[in-house]
Interface confidence: low
Amino acid sequence: SAPGEDEECGRVRDFVAKLANNTHQHVFDDLRGSVSLSWVGDSTGVILVLTTFHVPLVIMTFGQSKLYRSEDYGKNFKDITDLINNTFIRTEFGMAIGPENSGKVVLTAEVSGGSRGGRIFRSSDFAKNFVQTDLPFHPLTQMMYSPQNSDYLLALSTENGLWVSKNFGGKWEEIHKAVCLAKWGSDNTIFFTTYANGSCKADLGALELWRTSDLGKSFKTIGVKIYSFGLGGRFLFASVMADKDTTRRIHVSTDQGDTWSMAQLPSVGQEQFYSILAANDDMVFMHVDEPGDTGFGTIFTSDDRGIVYSKSLDRHLYTTTGGETDFTNVTSLRGVYITSVLSEDNSIQTMITFDQGGRWTHLRKPENSECDATAKNKNECSLHIHASYSISQKLNVPMAPLSEPNAVGIVIAHGSVGDAISVMVPDVYISDDGGYSWTKMLEGPHYYTILDSGGIIVAIEHSSRPINVIKFSTDEGQCWQTYTFTRDPIYFTGLASEPGARSMNISIWGFTESFLTSQWVSYTIDFKDILERNCEEKDYTIWLAHSTDPEDYEDGCILGYKEQFLRLRKSSVCQNGRDYVVTKQPSICLCSLEDFLCDFGYYRPENDSKCVEQPELKGHDLEFCLYGREEHLTTNGYRKIPGDKCQGGVNPVREVKDLKKKCTSNFLSPEKQNSKSN
């Protein structure tokens, strides 16, 4: 029988009445155009909704937008368009919401052709009031907040000027011209690339990388011959053109660009690209595109300096620069990532790693599923997950995989069971242990979301017909109840719940269509009365993450330590609550070879934990360039994995000597870097 339809499923008592009392409809007085929704702050209940409608006239397009505000998680909305003087807001800039709980919002207005500059509306009180400000430039990008100080904003103009405000957009100053890309770093630092000759496109590969640490009073050129740059964790990356040809290489800095080292990664040609897939303060996952138009490349994982890389996964699917990759960080369990590979027969298969890219395997076949037509052997196959690539291919996949840090172990995704991803209609699968085991949760494609830190899962069937039914589960997707939230079905456009999965409110967005008109409508359902009581100690059980062999003393050890979590029992119907904090107990493991990367000049043969010398480097001195100095490496082939906390056990020898010799790539060496002040 389908999941949730067997006799074992107990019904939640009187849920229809409880939900009916907590279902709030809001019909927006709008013609249907586009709608965007933003949450302002955390646990504030404030939502801003911007609706825009374009009326094509003979000569031009006339636009109209409305702004609505809710302060009760979407149950009621108030039209606050008058606070922005009924101005048409440019949706391509979205609503720029300030970091943390700053309560700041910036909306960018559409202005008439001949105006000197753009116009913004600013609020610093969670959108209760707005101040109109005329800009001395036309913005090209959305205003970017400094992560450290929400009063500091930067924006690029259509003339490629870099503009900065120190008083939350009240006054603006152009700090540099001819800027291609600008990003906030840490400590209110701004990094940006500039062009000298014609344009960003013409100078690609000849850009300069600049830094200002004082909002434009002084500058330092920290790189030349730049193609592009990126920030990830504590790493600053730049791809730099080689002196001799059209190839480029990645350089990395961990001191804001004062010193650089060349990453031990393959160089790439004109048609190839690098992509930072994920980064934290310990390490980075880097994708390096394969030559030719293959649609795949290689994933490398870095050491703790971002310099030495280990090959992690071959034939990693990534279609083009800025194209599609299925790479997904499973945020509900440490060390877990899922992605797709393009196999030799050109089918697409899903792979998972539980140890931050050390090893990749196929996903275990769900117990309650049979292998589909893609499987050669009907009894042996794997689960394959649909993510961004499938969505871009217009397969019947409404949502990417979902996981939440505070819903420990839960992963929800569309998938098919076979030897490869299938183009047939997918089902929805759930894992409650971070991806080790999977169960079919729902037949056919659905939208889904997690509420109350995993206490409730909500789903809506993906259908081209109007809908009026929502499904919910209080036991991590084992059993499902259905609730008819309206008599009149709506064309469904999206589920919205507060980011962070702590809320118990879900908003169902859609539109009603009649012969003459169509209107936006939202239904907000509060599940607080379904989970009647607060969870107590007895509602939780101890769960060892990454456990695969309970007999083994080292069971659950990943990256040098194991973690025990307190998890809500599936049978407990209670509220984790908004203040729920994940309770975990870490314990350190003994070191084994699994806790070490292969060092520069070494690699791991398949299915072997030992690192062996690369044949082409056998007998050679291991020397590499670090911070512009030649280093000599004495190693027996191992380097501790970034973030690995193991102690004792195996301890391979490793020593690095400074050869006191200069070495530079074509990059600016530190002593040649220049500074200037405004």
């Epitope: 599609e324 969505i391 871009s392 291919q393 019947n396 081209s464 017909r465």
Partner: antibody, heavy 129, light 107 residues
Amino acid sequence: QVQLVQSGAEVKKPGASVKVSCKASGYTFTKYYMSWVRQAPGQGLEWMGIINPIGGSTSYAQKFQGRVTMTRDTSTSTVYMELSSLRSEDTAVYYCARDPSGIALLGPASRYYYGMDVWGQGTTVTVSS
Amino acid sequence: EIVMTQSPATLSVSPGERATLSCRASQSVSSNLAWYQQKPGQAPRLLIYGASTRATGIPARFSGSGSGTEFTLTISSLQSEDFAVYYCQQARLGPWTFGGGTKVEIK
């Protein structure tokens, strides 16, 4: 310039199979889907299915399921459509058409449709005993 | 599958006149609709995609409108080269489906 060149006309007996090729040039082959559409004499257009050149995945119209196979060879930028168990009502002109709803043109969850923007010249398949 | 219905089946128009062709979908296809022109012995040619965007090289006299289930192709002033069969096609849900076609002939 961008073009799709199809193989020549075929005459087949009922029960046989036919394999039509479609060679793409003038663009990056793996960046676009390829659809196959047929047109019986004096009739309208009928979509048969679609292939994604980068992964080789396919989706066929229910009517042709089990009888049609679409494949591709990225080394020669060619797609193939094979139709088996031919019957007289399969007599038609078969077209391949580039379908830019494919790979690099759409961001996730985009619903925008670009239409079949480049068509082959057509291959006439006659099924007769 | 989504059924596309075109009307009229035949439209007789004089050169220089306006022609309005209709296409109806059995369920909403949003704006995932294209229009094609086909002349005898030739492959179809894309005219309009995304319900209302003219394809490259298509004259401004061709325009598309509509969203959901009702769509219209308008030829503002028919030229001699415009007499042909016109098809609409949806790509909202697989399988892609075509309308039966509207033949525009000289009055």
